[in-house]
Interface confidence: medium
């Protein structure tokens, strides 16, 4: 057989045995010479370059560029190709011999006892067990242990060729220690050497890159990239990195195997590549490719070589923010810039701390905008290592959806007296103001919740058909006053009133304000009754555990059977839109109350005593009359709100000041509480009395200090007190400065 | 046969507790990492909590984490998830399933857990 | 953390090549295993460390993976590959975590 490429001036090396495959039996002589054009070599089976004692080469007698190759008494260990060749060149010549020895069809390894033969557990990979046979036609089987398994070759996927060993799929012996063929000649077994089986993996999970994204760095910094291979176990890696400028002085890759922890069914292996001084044509994609031999995964991230560092605003950057009250702003700070700079956030002036409201960072966040976030924002930009600045200013405008203040003050069923004028009020508040504040009204009989109709929250009301206050037709007589503008706690509002010149009928009347962001409304139930009138004694608000009483007076030759009546069990809905009376209507929703009656010459009078008033007790009341007459109903219903027991508490604190004297001290000391917590003043722990400069005003609210003097340092405490508890803050007052000697002295 | 069986699902009230187990046969247990991965009614696959072959290692989904725990006892060849404080959306279908790393070769049948009031 | 999209359904029929997608920033450099799941069963491995096919899976199942985006491809569809397909792979951002696709809804027309 030839082997190579024939030369233009050389021919192959000529055998004197012109075959290519010869058997020939144990214990015989071997002989084989090799003719030529130049220096001729021999390579045989077991010793690919030379020296062996049993095997002999010798220059022929008869000529130059000759070789005979001699073995006396071969044995089955001989079997294989023998190769003549010219020297430094890749032209040979080559037979495969057989030495049949049935003793011992299989060759044995050099080495000794036994091989290793590595596998996968690829599905789609073979194995070659290197069994070769002194025999070419025998039949082979394969033993795996344990537990014991034998595999016969099925003329597919399993084979044994005597050159080249037994192939298998690997995955069908990998769960086997060790591997041997066997060989059956007239009913006796013949062994291969023992060859251990061990499975290397290949399955790589993944290859990341660290830092993944974003890498920047101005020329001369030093840039580090580790890639992270994680595989299964028994797995080596070859890591290949690609990069901008492959030819680069500083470069340094560094691989190694990664500790993991115990438990973990899986290997790590990491590469760094370093470049101690980037340039800018160290710009570009940086790959790296992780491989196992059958399997290559590979990641990739993109580095940014800047000439200098820099900071700018990116041309995204808003100047004008318009946000709705309760909404989330996100402001991003949105710039150019290497390293990333140091951001700061501003608000008119007063740097702005993260807390659990506001977030300020790359983007200014605003959790939930409320009208005084309005204002401007400054952001300014700091690069961390040239200490440029650059600073853009952001106008956050908040707008605030039309607010009608009375909405959650006025009962919603109060009852107003027949042929009373009456004043009906919206207050708005709304950014930007409204651009209208529109009266509908509607009668009340035809809007009336009749228990059949159902009502939902969303539409309390069962009428529609709300008519213009211009068409009071059928209903009391309106004249809508124009819109006045009105500073009320420190905001601008509008109001609206519309005057009912005379309350002849019951009627419901709506508001309704607009603005850019939304609309904001109120229903007002306008009950007129001619029948019985509510009072309370002594307070209109009382407070837990005082006692309150509720009068229903009514005019004895009109009405009889006075009932007081608490609607219940749930409170009625006061936001969206209240159910109109007459509750009369509805006894179904009453809870009957015990009372008192009480007659003077004109009216009867059933008062209603709650003694220890609870927050239980709020809600509406309803007292019933009837006519004498035509013993029609009469009810008149008003809302008691119980105020809560609050234990004193103190605003704001007093500050520590130092004044000199002469000069004067003012501080104020605001309590709240309920109820109405009192004020006492100490200095030095005993009780502040008053005299011509110590001067308490507002029920002790402001303490004045007037011409100050040195007896008048020292610690000052403002005690709040009620039958709940008391609350104190305390600040010391340092008088400066020599005392004045009088004319007296 | 290979297979995994889990029991202890059913009815709870929300921040109620739940243990589940997923008894192993066929393989050798203490071999193998496990999962537990839950569907809701509808929707797709949901990966909760993972445990190494001798329990040293663990890690949760960030929905479950502070909340659930994964145990496992070898000698038992049993696997556990103890569901603590569960909510309305920790209904689902909870499978047990065998291997550690790369992919999921192994499933139970799954146990249904359903949190109500 | 790491997200992968698939498309919600697909629809092919008969005899033809059916391929769901299984979307993912660089996912090529991951491997992803698919999972077939039929009403009322527990899911099964159909391909794993992107390509590779369990024994018992047909070879009509194929899986490839690169850049972006990695594929499993159904040749010769039949009704009873009608089930829902979910793509896996580990997050590494978050060590250990597993991450399912949304799942695909393949229907056989």
């Known amino acids: 057989a030839s082997v190579g490429l024939p030369s233009v001036s050389l021919d192959l090396p000529r055998l004197s045995i012109q075959k290519d495959i010869l058997t020939i039996k144990a214990n015989t002589t071997l002989q084989i010479t090799c003719r030529g054009q130049r220096d001729l070599d021999w390579l045989w089976p077991n010793n690919q370059s030379g020296s062996e004692q049993r095997v002999e080469v010798t220059e022929c007698s008869d000529g130059l560029f000759c070789k005979t190759l001699t073995i006396p008494k071969v044995i089955g260990n001989d079997t294989g190709a023998y190769k003549c060749f010219y020297r430094e060149t890749d032209l040979a010549s080559v037979i495969y011999v057989y030495v049949q020895d049935y003793r011992s069809p299989f060759i044995a390894s050099v080495s000794d006892q036994h091989g290793v033969v590595y596998i996968t557990e690829n599905k789609n990979k073979t194995v070659v067990i290197p069994c070769l046979g002194s025999i070419s036609n025998l039949n082979v089987s394969l033993c795996a242990r344990y537990p014991e398994k034998r595999f016969v070759p099925d003329g597919n996927r399993i084979s044994w060729d005597s050159k080249k060993g037994f192939t298998i799929p690997s995955y069908m012996i990998s769960y086997a220690g060790m591997v041997f063929c066997e060989a059956k000649i007239n009913d006796e077994s013949y062994q291969s050497i023992m060859y251990i089986v061990v499975v290397v993996g290949y399955r790589i999970y993944d290859v990341v890159l660290s830092p993944s994204h974003g890498i920047e760095l101005s020329v001369g910094e030093k840039l580090v990239l580790n890639c992270t291979a994680r595989t299964e176990l028994n797995v080596g890696i070859d890591f290949n990195w690609e990069y901008p400028s492959s030819k680069h002085q500083h470069k340094k890759l560094v691989n190694r195997d990664l500790k993991t922890q115990s438990g973990s069914e899986m290997k790590k292996f990491l590469s760094t590549l370093t470049i101690d001084g980037v340039t800018r044509s160290d710009q570009g994609l940086y790959t790296c490719a992780a491989s196992s031999g059958l399997m290559t995964k590979k990641n990739s991230t993109f580095v940014r070589v800047h000439e200098k560092p820099f900071v700018a605003f990116g041309s995204g950057m808003e100047s004008l923010v318009e946000a709705t009250v309760g909404e989330r702003v996100r402001i991003p700070a949105k710039y150019l810039g290497y390293p990333p700079p140091e951001i700061k956030w501003y608000k008119n002036g007063i740097p702005l701390e993260s807390n659990h409201t506001i977030k300020a960072g790359h983007v200014l966040t605003i959790m939930e905008v409320s009208e005084r976030d309005t204002g401007n924002y400054t952001v300014i930009l700091t690069n961390p290592i040239s200490k440029e600045k650059q600073s853009h200013v952001v106008s956050l405008v908040v707008y605030v959806p039309p607010q009608i203040g009375e909405k959650s003050l006025i009962s919603p069923v109060d009852s107003y007296q027949y042929g009373t004028t009456q004043t009906l009020t919206c207050t708005v508040y709304a950014i930007p103001p409204p651009h209208h504040i529109h009266w509908y009204w509607q009668l009340e009989e035809e809007c009336a919740n009749e228990p059949s109709q159902a009502v939902s929250v969303t539409n309390p009301y069962p009428c529609e058909e709300w008519r213009s206050v211009e068409d009071f037709q059928g209903g009391n007589k309106i004249e809508v006053n124009k819109n006045q503008f009105a500073l009320i706690e420190g905001k601008n509002k509008t109001v609206s009133t519309l005057v009912i010149q005379a309350a002849n009928v019951s009627a419901l009347y709506k508001c309704e304000a607009v603005n850019k962001v939304g609309r904001g409304e109120r229903v007002i139930s306008f009950h007129v009754t001619r029948g019985p009138e509510i009072t309370l004694q002594p307070d209109m608000q009382p407070t837990e555990q005082e006692s309150v009483s509720l009068w229903c007076t009514a005019d004895r030759s009109t009405f009889e059977n006075l009932t007081w009546y608490k609607l219940g069990p749930q409170p009625l809905p006061i936001h969206v839109g209240e159910l109109p009376t007459p509750v009369c209507k509805n006894l179904d929703t009453l809870w009957k109350l015990n009372a008192t009656m009480f007659s003077n010459s004109t009216n009867d009078i059933l008062i209603m005593e709650l003694k220890n008033a609870s927050l239980q007790d709020q809600g509406d009341y309803v007292c019933l009359a009837q006519d004498r007459k035509t013993k029609k109903r009469h009810c008149v219903v008003r809302q008691l709100t119980v105020l809560e027991r609050v234990a004193p508490t103190i605003t704001g604190n007093l500050e520590n000041q130092t004044t000199s004297i002469g000069e004067s001290i003012e501080v104020s000391c605001t309590a709240s509480g309920n109820p109405p917590p009192q004020i006492m003043w100490f200095k030095d722990n005993e009780t502040l009395v008053e005299d011509s400069g110590i001067v308490l005003k507002d029920g002790n609210r402001n303490l004045t200090i007037r011409r100050v003097r040195k007896e008048d340092e020292g610690l000052y405490t403002c005690q709040a007190c009620s039958v709940l508890g008391c609350a104190k803050v305390e600040a010391f007052f340092i008088i400066e400065g020599a005392q004045e000697k009088t004319n007296l002295e | 046969e290979v297979q995994l069986v889990e029991s202890g699902g059913g009815v709870v009230q929300p921040g109620r507790s739940l243990r589940l187990s997923c008894a192993a046969s066929?393989?050798?247990?203490?071999?193998?990492?496990m999962h537990w991965v839950r569907q809701a009614p509808g929707k797709g696959l949901e990966w909760v909590a993972v445990?190494?072959?001798?329990?040293?290692?663990?890690y949760y989904a960030d929905s479950v984490k502070g909340r659930f725990t994964i145990s496992r006892d070898n000698s038992k060849n049993t696997l556990y998830l103890q569901m603590n404080s569960l909510r309305a959306e920790d209904t689902a279908v909870y499978y047990c399933?065998?291997?550690?790393?790369?992919?999921?070769?192994?499933w139970g049948q799954g146990t249904l857990v359903t949190v109500s009031s | 953390s790491y997200e992968l999209m698939q498309p919600p359904s697909v629809s092919e029929a008969p005899g033809m090549t059916a391929q769901i997608t299984c979307g993912g920033n660089?996912?090529?450099?991951?491997?992803v295993h698919w999972y077939q799941q039929k009403p009322g069963q527990a899911p099964v491995l159909v391909i794993y460390?992107?390509?590779e096919r369990p024994s018992g899976i047909p070879d009509r199942f194929s899986g490839s993976n690169s850049g972006n985006t990695a594929s499993l491809t159904i040749n010769r569809v039949e009704a009873g590959d009608e089930a829902d397909y979910y793509c896996?792979?580990?997050?590494?951002?978050?060590?250990?975590?597993?991450?399912f696709g949304g799942g695909t809804k393949l229907t056989v027309l």
């Open positions: 399933a065998k291997d550690w790393s790369g992919p999921i070769t192994l």
């Open positions: 066929g393989f050798t247990f203490s071999s193998y990492g």
């Open positions: 445990i190494s072959y001798d329990g040293s290692n663990k």
């Open positions: 660089n996912i090529g450099s991951k491997s």
């Open positions: 460390y992107d390509s």
């Open positions: 896996q792979v580990w997050d590494s951002s978050s060590d250990h975590h597993v991450v």
